[in-house]
Interface confidence: medium
């Protein structure tokens, strides 16, 4: 993979180490933590990004509460196992031999078990609901302007094909972005909705993964769109398997 030839950096992933050791002295970038080569002309997979993040620990985030309707990333940061393509391995275990199954965005979808736990396949997250609350503004945003700007953002910044942005809902101050992408719909080279959602989440939190100078400056008709709360819900192609104890807790 090539990266910027001028100063050998990866524009899509600042959590990389780059050096001109590729074929013909070309710049090659490797993700921190895993050492895997990354393609700097597209988004890096969430698994490799999480692994890189764990290799350079920062203060823990405040986590959202789980929803009864969908999976929420309620377990927080962990050091994931990624397959050779950079995807999450279906089974994840910690250093104390506690294991669990995850979906394609790395969110736990079963109760925790021991090393005997089997996760037969990596279940695809096909529907992501991004729930945002924006800071108070003089008036509500125009819905069609907001819709167009968010669709443009996902198309232009994250390179997500427009057909995967299913809907943008708005009831001031709540904005909901629905991303849908079935296994059958995702062609080779398509950005994964899970990766796009993760980049968006980090952008919104002011923790951009892009190498560029500034963070995301999102505006609707010139008016800044400042987000004060983000919740992301994940729906899998196969429903998660949690015990009744957890569901009634």
């Amino acid at each position: 993979h090539t990266a910027a030839q001028d100063n050998c950096t990866c524009p899509t992933n600042k959590m990389t180490v780059c050096s001109p050791d590729g074929p013909g002295g070309r710049c090659q970038c490797r993700a921190l933590g895993s050492g895997m080569a990354v393609d700097c002309s597209t988004l890096t997979s969430k698994c490799l990004l999480l692994k890189a993040r764990m290799s350079a620990p920062k203060n823990a985030r405040t986590l959202v509460r789980p929803s009864e309707h969908a999976l929420v990333d309620n377990d927080g940061l962990y050091d994931p196992d990624c397959d050779p393509e950079g995807r999450f391995k279906a089974r994840q275990c910690n250093q104390t031999s506690v294991c669990w199954c995850v979906n394609s965005v790395g969110v736990r979808r079963t109760d925790k078990g021991d090393l005997s736990l089997r996760c037969d396949e990596l279940v695809r997250t096909h529907h992501i609901l991004i729930d945002l609350r924006h800071r108070p503004t003089a008036g509500a945003f125009n819905h069609s302007d907001l819709d167009a700007e968010l669709r443009r953002l996902f198309r232009e910044r994250y390179r997500l094909h427009p057909k995967f942005v299913a809907a943008v809902h708005y009831e001031q101050p709540t904005i909901q972005i629905e991303l849908r992408q079935n296994t059958s719909q995702k062609a080779a080279g398509d950005v994964d909705i899970g990766d796009a959602a993760y980049y968006f989440e980090r952008d919104i939190k002011g923790e951009s993964l892009f190498q560029g100078r500034g963070g995301l400056d999102l505006r609707v008709r010139g008016e800044p769109l400042q987000v004060e709360r983000t919740l992301i819900y994940y729906l899998d192609e196969i429903p998660p398997k949690f015990s009744m104890k957890r569901l009634t807790a």
Epitope: A4, Q5, P11, R152, E156, R157, R159, F210, G212
Partner: nanobody, 124 residues
């Protein structure tokens, strides 16, 4: 580095057309936001049109409907088709490139690489 070279400027009568071209070379050319700016003596450089890799072009209100911007990522070329030219379109036109993977805007501060410029003169 990224290098940009404009061509296609010249003199034309009001109501006429010109087609500006910008050849871009360097790293991550297709992933960069690209724009056309123009500047007249004593005035700030202003954004005319901008485009990202996959997006639709954005235009300044003064040129909307008259100018059409496009890019050919295979040839690393940026084009600006200018129709129905007016004397107030007279300026030096600059091609600009932004950071890779940034959104296309008409703000000068979002662009870090610039061409040398090509003169466009529209007379009545």
């Amino acid at each position: 580095q990224v290098q940009l070279q404009e061509s296609g400027g010249g003199s034309v009568l009001a109501g006429g057309s010109l087609r500006l071209s910008c050849t871009v070379s360097g790293s991550f050319v297709s992933s960069r936001s690209m724009a056309w700016f123009r500047q007249t003596p004593g005035k700030e450089r202003e954004g005319v049109a901008a485009i990202s890799q996959y997006g639709d072009p954005k235009y300044a209100g003064s040129v909307k409907g008259r100018f059409t911007m496009s890019r050919d990522n295979a040839k690393n070329t940026l084009l600006l088709q200018m129709n129905s030219l007016k004397p107030e379109d007279t300026a030096i036109y600059y091609c600009a490139a932004g950071e890779a993977w940034e959104l296309a805007t008409l703000s000068r501060s979002d662009y870090i690489y610039w061409g040398q410029g090509t003169q466009v003169t529209v007379s009545s």
